[in-house]
Amino acid sequence: MKVLQEPTCVSDYMSISTCEWKMNGPTNCSTELRLLYQLVFLLSEAHTCIPENNGGAGCVCHLLMDDVVSADNYTLDLWAGQQLLWKGSFKPSEHVKPRAPGNLTVHTNVSDTLLLTWSNPYPPDNYLYNHLTYAVNIWSENDPADFRIYNVTYLEPSLRIAASTLKSGISYRARVRAWAQCYNTTWSEWSPSTKWHNSYREPFEQH
């Protein structure tokens, strides 16, 4: 039994880091493998993560962690029974994938304006809370070409757009994702999408 693709890990900078790897053949990850991880500080001890299957030869492990700080560094040991298959380390602050925003809502009752709001996925005491920026994706269910991205580079989790920038009388969907420039993070997953029917009054044309 050998590791084909070494574990790579990302942290949500809050409580969970996710490590994925591939074995050289079909593996029952949860019964055959264990990933031990230990924070490199005085008095810390190793914790065990039981991996799950992620495709035939793929494994994934969700490591429970405390609030993350930039100094945190973990040793990682991948074991198959008594055999050490791989040894490495992981600095969560250098491999951050933010949590996805939640509670995306489209408010259509504002005069000819669409107000999209969502929730910051972090509590106020988390470092990322004040460092997230967002991308909002809006697309038409009827027209695949009608697909747009709005970059929200301010901290407020909201976006206002004129309803008239979208076609009237058809349904749209929106979703949002986040990233943090300060840690050069990857993008989060997209939030669940929300749907609304876009309708607005055409401006009265004078001749």
Epitope: F41, L42, S44, E45, V69, A71, N73
Partner: antibody
Framework: EVQLVESGGGLVQPGGSLRLSCAAS????????MSWVRQAPGKGLEWVSA????????YYADSFKGRFTISRDNSKNTLYLQLNSLRAEDTAVYYC??????????WGQGTLVTVSS | DIVMTQSPLSLPVTPGEPASISCKSS???????????LDWYLQKPGQSPQLLIY???HRASGVPDRFSGSGSGTDFTLKISRVEAEDVGIYYC?????????FGGGTKVEIK
């Protein structure tokens, strides 16, 4: 929210014994090392002992080795400190604390041990 | 054992003014990853100690941003940018580099 509640302190004669307990809640107890720290009346803080999350590793300041024993019961979320051969100079408030990144992130309210004849 | 030495022993302060406490260790607490294994604690009158700063510079959750930690190696400083009445108490530094964990002797901060 981390909560630590010490108990078991009291008045004991020199040479006597006491067992201190610390009931933990608000966090996954078995994942954390725990420490005991004491403070003699009007004095500073003195680290006594620590124990790893699994209970397999214990650590003591030299002056307490052989007299004090730290232990834990993860099924009861409880930390213990057995105090033997007590002396007058062991009179102090004993605090339990949760360790994280080596430091003491969360303290109990303390329990007073008085050694006197 | 690592010896921690704090100064001053007592620090009378005026509310609204800054304050500074020094802590020196008998050996370096700097770690190669760029942080220092030093914590600061405050024990308010009649209360248990509480963590203020860990790993030299990281403020603990809920600690006001008027508290900051600095320094490296063997010389460390806790600064209070503007002292408030609720900041009175005894401040301790503690090294987390090796066991036994050792504390400084404490600095008593009191209002003038």
């Amino acid at each position: 929210e981390v909560q630590l509640v010490e108990s078991g302190g009291g008045l004991v004669q020199p040479g006597g014994s006491l067992r201190l307990s610390c009931a933990a809640s608000g966090f996954t107890f078995s994942r954390y090392a725990m420490s005991w720290v004491r403070q003699a009346p009007g004095k500073g803080l003195e680290w006594v002992s620590a124990i790893g999350g699994s209970g397999g590793h214990t650590y003591y300041a030299d002056s307490f080795k052989g007299r004090f024993t730290i232990s834990r019961d993860n099924s009861k979320n409880t930390l213990y400190l057995q105090l033997n051969s007590l002396r007058a100079e062991d009179t102090a408030v004993y605090y339990c604390a949760r360790n994280l990144r080596g430091g003491l992130h969360g303290w109990g309210q303390g329990t007073l041990v008085t050694v006197s004849s | 054992d690592i010896v921690m030495t704090q100064s001053p022993l007592s620090l009378p302060v005026t509310p609204g003014e800054p304050a500074s406490i020094s802590c020196k260790s008998s050996q370096s607490l700097h770690h190669g990853q760029g942080y220092n294994r030093l914590d600061w604690y405050l024990q308010k009158p009649g209360q248990s100690p509480q963590l203020l700063i860990y790993l030299g510079t990281h403020r603990a959750s809920g600690v006001p941003d008027r508290f900051s930690g600095s320094g490296s190696g063997t010389d460390f400083t806790l600064k209070i940018s503007r002292v408030e009445a609720e900041d009175v108490g005894i401040y301790y530094c503690m090294q987390t580099h090796q066991t036994p964990l050792t504390f400084g002797g404490g600095t008593k901060v009191e209002i003038k």
